[in-house]
């Protein structure tokens, strides 16, 4: 039959070449002389000439060694023709399978593999995967089947078997307890890949395992005891820098310190922050300290990390003894603002009040007083006793110096310390009203027609306060009542002036006396311009003559 079974040829054959593989034979050769040929890749097309055929005998020849990793299978066609070139058989398929030899070593995909694992993890934790390839066949033979192993580990601490590798996947896992970044931050493993499923050729690579930091070390104060001196009253004053050491990775959350005042700061006088570079705890005053109240504070400060501890760790505590230094403090007026009621217009020399200051310092310092600001110059202050007396007339109605009945004075106290210090107080004099002002009409000039005159309504004002104001009473004096009438309205806060007899055009003085509810009387002269006109007028028509 014109058929041939698949031909298996080992790669890397040593010859001699050409090497006879198989014979092509057509049974038509009994009738006529047959000539054989082959076509296809490896014969007459690239790679040409690998195979040939003996034209007359039909022997299939291999001309050179094969490489399975280059071409694993050749598909050729065999041809049989008669002497005249006529085809005597259909083309026959010839399959040549190149069988594998273990002629390649495994190759790692990288010279150096890098992986990482957290310190202190459980055995079994996966770290990384390494990969090696082998060009040889791994399907029908073990030539390309790679088995992984760890050849060596550096350093060998805490012992030489910290990692294991999955024989077939190349996954490296932790196998032992004791990974400690602070002792060994990095392991270098020499890994092997061996073909023939572990019984063949070996190649090596390096796997570097970085041990990542876990917060398994507590920050520790060094030193644990501090003494500091702070002037009293200083706010935001740096008291002390506290230093800690932490074996975890610098500038990581496991290293960065967090400080907490655990005790001794009952008055919430202190605060502590972390310096971003040095990691020190900076203890400062949040409020001023008072030497006279407490001259020594003992603080207890605990330190932890930004990151939580991965295990139960004892926290470090520092003790800071803060000595408060005495400072000459300013006298303080008690109260800082003093409100005193005093009648306006009291006689000169009359006492107003006593306003004194206290010195926070324990020594019996002498305090002297003086007035710092007295806008109207109405007061004097005794330098020794703090007695305030009137030296001018206190006038409630003085709008330049008095606001809302209050006259504001600033006083000063000075101690005899070295250097001396001063404190100020504010004296708020509430001036009690006295009926010292009579009612006044507004306006004090009017224009009125002498025929059918319009009544003139004048507003009454009184600088005093109730009850020294309305209801007001009005009275015309000096014969003004011959021509004029004056009546106060029902509310008692306006006066109506009316012309009751004809007056020729001219300017006249109307003498109006107004008195308040306390019978304080005030005489006012109203200038009345009478015009020749009817009803309402604002200015006289035409020229007018005085008289």
């Amino acid at each position: 039959d014109w058929v041939v079974a698949p031909i298996s040829v080992p790669e890397n054959g040593k010859g001699p070449f050409p090497q006879r593989l198989n014979q092509l034979k057509s049974n038509k050769d009994r009738d006529t002389k047959i000539f054989y040929s082959i076509t296809g890749p490896g014969a007459d097309s690239p790679p040409e000439g690998v195979f040939a055929v003996e034209k007359e005998t039909g022997w299939l020849l291999l001309n050179k060694p094969l490489d399975r990793e280059e071409i694993a299978k050749y598909e050729l066609f065999g041809h049989a023709v008669s002497e005249n070139g006529a085809s005597v058989e259909d083309p026959m398929n010839i399959s040549i399978i190149v069988t594998d030899q273990n002629d390649h070593k495994p190759k790692f995909t990288q010279d150096t593999f890098r992986g990482s694992v957290l310190e202190g993890v459980l055995p079994g934790t996966s770290v990384m995967q390494v990969t090696a390839t082998d060009e040889d066949d791994a399907i029908y033979t073990y030539n390309g089947v790679v088995a992984y192993s760890i050849h060596s580990q550096e350093p060998k601490d805490p012992h030489d078997l910290m990692f294991t590798i999955h024989r077939s996947t190349g996954t490296i896992s932790v196998i032992s307890s004791g990974l400690d970044r602070e002792k060994v931050p990095e392991y270098t493993l020499t890994i092997q890949a061996t073909d023939m499923d572990g019984d063949g050729s070996t190649t090596t690579a390096v796997a570097v395992v970085e041990i990542l930091d876990a917060n398994d070390n507590a920050p520790m104060f060094d030193p644990q005891k501090y003494e500091a001196h702070v002037p009293e009253n200083a706010v935001g004053h740096e008291v002390q820098r506290l230093t800690v050491t932490d074996l975890d990775a610098p500038n990581s959350p496991a290293w960065r310190a967090t400080y907490l005042i655990m005790g001794g700061d009952d008055g919430d006088h202190f605060t502590i922050t972390t310096h971003p570079e040095s990691n020190q705890g900076i203890l400062t005053t949040r409020k001023g300290l008072d030497f006279e109240a407490k001259n020594q504070h003992t603080l207890y400060v605990e330190v932890t990390n930004e990151a939580p501890f991965v295990l139960k760790l004892p926290t470090s505590t520092a003790t800071i003894v803060v000595h408060v230094e005495d400072v000459n403090e300013a006298p303080v007026f008690v109260p800082p603002s003093k409100v005193v009621e005093v009648q306006e217009g009291i006689p000169t020399g009359e006492p107003v009040c006593v306003y004194t200051a206290e010195d926070p310092d324990k020594e019996n310092q002498k305090i002297s007083y003086r007035i710092l600001r007295d806008p109207a110059g109405w007061l004097a202050m005794d330098p020794d006793s703090g007695q305030v007396t009137a030296v001018g007339t206190l006038d409630r109605e003085d709008e330049q110096f008095v606001r809302n009945n209050i006259y504001e004075v600033m006083v000063l106290a000075m101690d005899n310390g070295s250097p001396p210090t001063t404190g100020t107080g504010t004296l708020l004099l509430t001036l009690i009203d006295v009926n010292d002002h009579g009612p006044v009409p507004e306006p004090r000039q009017i224009t009125i027609c002498n025929q059918s005159p319009v009544r003139q309504v004048l507003n009454i004002t009184d600088k005093d306060l109730s009850p020294h104001t309305s209801p007001f009473q009005a009275q015309l004096t000096d014969d003004s009542d011959i021509y004029w009438t004056a009546e106060v309205n029902e509310e008692g806060d306006t006066v109506v002036l009316s012309l009751k007899k004809f007056l020729k055009q001219d300017t006249y003085d109307v003498h109006l006396s107004l008195s308040d509810h306390g019978n304080k009387e005030q005489l006012t002269v109203i200038r009345a311009t009478v015009c020749d006109c009817h009803g309402h007028v604002e200015t006289c028509p035409g020229p007018w003559k005085g008289g």
Epitope: E119, V121, S126, T164, V174, S177, G178, V310, K312
Partner: antibody, heavy 117, light 111 residues
């Protein structure tokens, strides 16, 4: 002499809780991962839980996940197993053992936990 | 992941040798050289007798030996003695999430 001594076992009703302790001596306790392994009456060994030397890493078998909590106090050289929501199938002798990753050694003498109404 | 497979029981006469097999997969026994064996007498705690396939801890008799081929590990006991009668458990390191597997146990009877 390396020694592990369990305690805390006893009879408890279903849904109840128990806390087992394992006191270690004779070795650097904090350097080793520790495990709890249990053995139901007449049955084989079952790995229950493990904890790393620092205590920062833990493992639980699916059968106890969410109910049991392993912990350790290295300052007291003691391993703990807090067992909540106990079931009848948790009845077993509970052993603590140092776990090197590849093997368990040494083992404690075991403490019996019986879950029954 | 199921337990490693061990025969439920084996027996032998004093002085004889016996072998207990422990079959796993290419992810446990076949993948790592971390097979260990434990002996447990009735009412007692397990005791490590072999680690890393064939390493004996100090104090363990050299009558106990171990081997591994492919996915199967074996424990051999030569010169059987009455005190060898016990339950034997194999264990293997494995890929997560379990990390460790136990065999179902083999009861050794010394006839």
């Amino acid at each position: 002499e390396v020694q592990l001594l369990e305690s805390g076992g006893g009879l408890v009703q279903p849904g109840g809780s128990l806390r087992l302790s394992c006191a270690a001596s004779g070795f650097t306790f904090s350097s080793y991962a520790m495990s709890w392994v249990r053995q139901a009456p007449g049955k084989g060994l079952e790995w229950v839980s493990a904890i790393s030397g620092s205590g920062g890493s833990t493992y639980y078998a699916d059968s106890v996940k969410g109910r049991f909590t392993i912990s350790r106090d290295n300052s007291k050289n003691t391993l703990y197993l807090q067992m909540n929501s106990l079931r009848a199938e948790d009845t077993a002798v509970y052993y603590c053992a140092s776990w090197g990753g590849g093997w368990f050694d040494p083992w404690g003498q075991g403490t019996m936990v019986t879950v029954s109404s | 992941q199921s337990a490693l497979t061990q025969p439920a029981s084996v027996s032998g006469s004093p002085g004889q040798s016996i072998t207990i097999s422990c079959t796993g997969t290419s992810n446990d026994v076949g993948a790592y050289n971390y097979v260990s064996w434990y002996q447990q007498h009735p009412g007692k705690a397990p005791k490590l007798i072999l680690s890393e396939v064939n390493k004996r801890p100090s104090g363990v008799s050299n009558r106990f030996s171990g081997s591994k081929s492919g996915n199967t590990a074996s424990l051999s006991i030569s010169g059987l003695q009455a005190e060898d009668e016990a339950d034997y458990y194999c264990s293997s390191f494995t890929s997560g999430p379990v990390f460790n597997l136990f065999g179902g146990g083999t009861k050794l009877t010394v006839l």
